[in-house]
């Protein structure tokens, strides 16, 4: 779970160790604040749960790619 200390800075201290199916993901945001111990990705699932993930992992990178392509493609 992301942890908001002195909002609005949200940090991740631990990453999920489970790969999440891309079908369960709705969006993501990058955590890059130098106030945080590490850069991270926070995925938001289709049930609005937020999950911290390691941006160095290939499945995380692939999921971000998928979401970015999906966001830009107009939904018909």
């Amino acid at each position: 779970q992301p942890d908001a200390i002195n909002a609005p800075v949200t940090c991740c201290y631990n990453f999920t160790n489970r790969k999440i199916s891309v079908q369960r993901l709705a969006s993501y945001r990058r955590i890059t604040s130098s106030k945080c111990p590490k850069e991270a990705v926070i995925f938001k699932t289709i049930v609005a749960k937020e999950i911290c993930a390691d941006p160095k992992q290939k499945w995380v990178q692939d999921s971000m790619d998928h979401l970015d392509k999906q966001t830009q493609t107009p939904k018909t």
Epitope: R30, T32, S34, P37, E39, K56, K69, Q72
Partner: antibody, heavy 117, light 107 residues
Framework: QVQLVQSGAEVKKPGSSVKVSCKAS????????MHWVRQAPGQGLEWMGR????????KFDPKFQGRVTITADTSTSTAYMELSSLRSEDTAVYYC??????????WGQGTTVTVSS | DIQMTQSPSSLSASVGDRVTITCKAF??????RAWYQQKPGKAPKLLIH???SLEHGVPSRFSGSGSGTDYTLTISSLQPEDFATYYC?????????FGGGTKVEIK
């Protein structure tokens, strides 16, 4: 706060090599990627490559492949960039920068490398 | 490599002016672009990354927009400290590439 401090200016002969260091403070380099970007006098920015200090995995612009070596020492939080077979066109300011996503949140102050006979 | 074409290469403007810099990628980069500001003798400074993410401490007069291959940096009201060179960069795929830069000068 995050700081990247680079080694001093270098003057090199054509054909020789140069090794530039970048010491990080305020962050654990194994949590990020360390990149090298250069800028020739009066010119734009050119990405050279990056290292994941956690596993020493590297990625380079094919233009520099074989001529550049990027290493990192997590025990001293230092990244290094070595460029070999120097030519006059390599005269530039060399920057280290950090960022896991492919953009660069923090930069070193730059190291001027002059290649001249 | 994904080529990034930035325009104009230079512009003259006055304090208070609205300034727009454009960047065109030679293929879709899905909003994965960053904007940097660089002053003479200094390292570049990250302003914006991704769709709209303004870096911490960057004034709200800076904004980014665009999608697909076309992106824009807007400075809504130019301040004296904004005279500098601006670069766009794509981070959709390595090798990461930069635009040629736009030098914003005092009119």
């Amino acid at each position: 706060q995050v700081q990247l401090v680079q080694s001093g200016a270098e003057v090199k002969k054509p054909g020789s090599s140069v090794k530039v260091s970048c010491k990080a403070s305020g962050l654990t380099i194994s949590h990020t990627y360390m990149h090298w970007v250069r800028q020739a006098p009066g010119q734009g920015l050119e990405w050279m490559g990056r290292i994941d200090p956690e596993n020493h995995n590297t990625k380079f612009d094919p233009k520099f492949q074989g001529r550049v070596t990027i290493t990192a020492d997590t025990s001293t939080s230092t990244a290094y960039m070595e460029l070999s077979s120097l030519r006059s066109e390599d005269t530039a300011v060399y920057y280290c920068a950090r960022g896991v996503f492919g953009f660069f949140e923090h930069w070193g102050q730059g190291t001027t490398v002059t290649v001249s006979s | 490599d994904i080529q990034m074409t930035q325009s104009p290469s230079s512009l003259s403007a006055s304090v208070g002016d609205r300034v727009t810099i454009t960047c065109k990628a030679f293929e879709d980069i899905y909003n994965r672009r960053a904007w940097y500001q660089q002053k003479p003798g200094k390292a570049p400074k990250l302003l914006i990354h991704g769709a709209t993410s303004l870096e911490h401490g960057v004034p709200s007069r800076f904004s980014g927009s665009g999608s697909g291959t076309d992106y824009t940096l807007t400075i809504s009201s130019l301040q004296p400290e904004d005279f500098a060179t601006y670069y766009c960069q794509q981070f959709w795929s390595a090798p990461y590439t930069f635009g040629g830069g736009t030098k914003v000068e005092i009119k």
